[in-house]
Every structure is written in C-alpha cells, then in structure tokens.
C-alpha cells in the first residue's frame, strides 16, 4: 500500500516491513467465502502478528483470521460484498498497518480442472476442453480463461489463447507434426468482479500425429 499519511495515520513508508497482499474466493465451500492474506516479505517474523478484518460484514463488526503456517485465513458467510473492508495487521491489539479493500476486487478463482485434448482425424484439429467449478457458482460465474500451450522442448515459448468458454479448437496445421505438447489453463474474473489469475490447472500432454500425405493430397 502506498500513499501519504493523513489525519494522524502512520505514514505507509514506516510500515513497509509489514506490507501484505490478500485474495478472496467466493462460494469456495458451499455458500462460504474465504479470504487469504500473507506478508509480501517471506522473512517477516509472524510470531504474535494477527490479521483482522472490519467493515462491510454482515451481523458483526470485525472478524479475526486463523493462522495456517505463513498465511492468514478466514472462511465465512459474513462478507457483505459491497463496500470496503479494513484489513489490519495487529500485534497485542495494536494495528501496525491497514488496507482498505473491496473484496470483490481481489477475487482469485479456483483453478480449472479436467483439462483434456482430443484429436479429430477427419477435421485435422484438436479439441481442448476443461471444466471449472465456477459454472455452478452464483457470484463469480463469468470468467476469462487463458489456455497456454507449448512444444515440450521449447521451455519458455508458450502460446496463449484467451476465451470465455471452456472449449477451444487448435488447428493441426498450426502445430508441429510428431511433437509432444504441454497445455494448461487458468482463469480470471470477468464482469463486475476483479482480481487475480487462478492457479494453473494440472498440465495435460498430447502428441501431434505425423503429416499423412495420401496420394493426390497437397501439403497443407
């Protein structure tokens, strides 16, 4: 968090040691939402440090986080999802640093799953399909997906395709023949909710066939 102190607030520069980031996940466990925060500096001594969220909550003023190793975590139905919450790092009941955050702007979707690739010989293409738990959700239903694929030997040469559906067709002519490919997918909120990319799905590996020139056929 950057910015100038105002009206008695401690200046943010003094509190760089305790800078933290958070992400929310809506309906992550039935109708329960979660909020996860962690210090940006992995070497921060978190002994005696607590996190608390206040404001934009239903029926309660504040909630305390549970500590799970180096992350701080809340699972609750009590997020109002409108307005800004104040998330503070505290020690002995005293706030060290705080951030005003709208939980609808820090949403991290769940990772897509069941990624698979089917080759269609007649169509000379590959149909990529995957699933997302968000199709069943009531809040973060609309996602943008990033499908990334690469030839296994090309370490950092990922090709990316953005799409809003869970199905993609890759044309065989755009891929190298007789090559092993790795493909994976991740998601980000789209429409009202904002936030971060999900984790990547587990990778799927597939091999492209050799070019099969039957008599009278032209090379593509």
């Amino acid at each position: 968090e950057s910015g100038y102190a105002q009206n008695g607030d401690l200046e943010d520069a003094e509190l760089d040691d305790y800078s933290f980031s958070c992400y929310s996940q809506l309906e992550v466990n039935g109708s329960q939402h979660s909020l996860t925060c962690a210090f940006e500096d992995p070497d921060v001594n978190t002994t005696n440090l607590e996190f608390e969220i206040c404001g934009a909550l239903v029926e309660v003023k504040c909630l305390s986080f549970r500590k799970l190793q180096e992350i701080y975590f809340i699972e609750t139905k009590k997020f109002l999802l409108i307005g800004k919450s104040n998330i503070c790092v505290k020690v002995g009941g005293k706030s060290l640093t705080c951030k005003k955050i709208d939980l609808t702007t820090i949403v991290k979707p769940e990772a897509p799953f069941d990624l698979s690739v089917i080759y269609r010989e007649g169509a000379n293409d590959f149909v990529v399909t995957f699933n997302t738990s968000h199709l069943q959700k009531k809040y973060v239903k609309v996602l943008m997906h990033d499908v990334a694929y690469r030839q296994e030997k090309d370490e950092n040469k990922w090709m990316h395709v953005n799409l809003s559906s869970t199905k993609l067709t890759l044309l065989q002519r755009n891929l190298q023949p007789e090559a092993m490919y790795e493909i994976k997918v991740r998601s980000i909120p789209d429409h009202y909710f904002k936030g971060f990319w999900s984790e990547w799905s587990p990778s799927y590996y597939f091999r492209t066939p050799e070019i099969n020139n039957s008599p009278g056929e032209m090379d593509p």
Epitope: E1, S2, G3, K84
Partner: antibody
Framework: QVQLQQSGAELMRPGASVTLSCKTS????????LHWVKQTPVRGLEWIGG????????AYNQKFKGKAILTSDRSSSTTYMELRSLASEDSAVYYC???????????WGTGTTVTVSS | DIVLTQSPASLAVSLGQRATISCRTS??????????MHWYQQKPGQPPKLLIY???NLESGVPARFSGSGSETDFTLNIHPVEEEDAATYFC?????????FGGGTKLEIK
C-alpha cells in the same frame, strides 16, 4: 470528519478550458476512489468518471472521453477535473464524490457551478 | 447504458405517513444476493446524500425510517413515518455496469 472541498464557480467563454479542484480531508487519500458527477436540470445526474489516487488509474463514461481529464495529487490530497473545449451544454453543477464501494458515492463535495456563455 | 426509471416523478405525503418510491432498471443490476442499487436524497442547493447502498443497507447516520428493498430490475425506497425534513428529491443509481447511471429523480412534498 470527511470533507471534499471544491473550487469556486466559473464563468467561461465557449472553446475555453477550465480545471476544477476537489481537496479532500478527514481520511487517507489513497484509500478511496474519487469520481465526478455532472448535474443539470435537463439531464439530471450523470457520472463523468473516476480516479484511483493510489495508482492514478482512471475510468471514464464514454460520453465524456475527450471532454474531461481526471488527475490527482497525493501530496495535497486533491483531485482535479479539466474540462476542454467548453460549450453551452457543459454549463452545470459538477460534484466530486468519494466512492465508498463499487461504485456508490458516500461523501459528496459542495459542487462547482460552471457557466459557459459568450 | 442501463436506464433507470423512477416513479412517480413527484408525490405528496402527509406527515407521519409512508412514502414509496420505485426505481426500475432496463436490465438486471443484481448478481445473486448482491444488488447494485443505491439511493440518494438531495435538497435544493445541496449535494446528494447517500441513504441506502446495495439496495437495503442503511448508510451510517441515516435514520431508520428510510429502508430499501428489491432485486434484479425492481427496487423500492420507503420512508415511514415521513417527517418535514424529508422534503427533497430522491435518486436511484446503479453500479453494476459502466457508465454508472442515475434515475431521473422523485420529488417528495410533505403535506
């Protein structure tokens, strides 16, 4: 308490530009986005755009793109709106307002009356 | 743009009675239980004042005689019992989609 103090009334010639200011106090400037709203008797209240003082990021109503330019100055906790190529239809009361959440407006400035006349 | 239509354009209510103002939107402004509709009060020569956010949440410091309800495309602001100081123009506003738009206003007169 939270206050948004706007600059005084302006009488402008057509074609001119004017910059309105909105000085905030009573809260940490970078914690809340600031927006501008136009009010006329004919068209009522119209959202012009908003700025995030933390990042400088802006969002505009398509209708006001090129007409309004929003900036902010963290050192003085002030946001500004420049209105360009003024015409009679820009005559209005302009409010700066703080966004308490996405995107409702929980604190409003006093308003600045801009009159465009030859 | 999402169009907000308020009705009535004006109404006169006796002191102590109920005032009901409607706001209809041209498309849904709800995402499940998140209703992105807000209500403001404006008195002559003053800026608007936030009364209700998220369709039904009372802004801090606003008297409990103000209440809001509704979902999807139909929203209502209720004032009961109406007091003299409630004479004003009331506006609804949606925030689901940019540009964030306002209703045309409802002028409340106290009889």
């Amino acid at each position: 308490q939270v206050q948004l103090q706007q600059s005084g009334a302006e009488l402008m010639r057509p074609g001119a530009s004017v910059t309105l200011s909105c000085k905030t106090s009573g809260y940490r400037f970078t914690d809340y986005e600031l927006h501008w709203v136009k009010q006329t008797p004919v068209r009522g209240l119209e959202w012009i755009g908003g700025i995030d003082p933390k990042t400088g990021g802006t969002a505009y109503n398509q209708k006001f793109k090129g007409k309004a330019i929003l900036t902010s100055d963290r050192s003085s906790s002030t946001t500004y709106m420049e209105l360009r190529s003024l015409a009679s239809e820009d005559s209005a009361v302009y409010y700066c307002t703080r966004s308490g959440g996405r995107w409702y407006f929980d604190v409003w400035g006093t308003g600045t009356t801009v009159t465009v006349s030859s | 743009d999402i169009v907000l239509t308020q009705s009535p354009a004006s109404l006169a209510v006796s002191l102590g009675q109920r005032a009901t103002i409607s706001c209809r939107t041209s498309e849904s402004v709800s995402i499940h239980l998140l209703h992105l509709m807000h209500w403001y009060q404006q008195k002559p020569g003053q800026p608007p004042k936030l009364l209700i956010y998220g369709a039904s949440n009372l802004e801090s410091g606003v008297p409990a005689r103000f209440s809001g309800s509704g979902s999807e495309t139909d929203f209502t602001l209720n004032i009961h019992p109406v007091e003299e100081e409630d004479a004003a123009t009331y506006f609804c506003q949606q925030s689901i989609k940019d540009p964030y738009t306002f209703g045309g206003g409802t002028k409340l007169e106290i009889k």
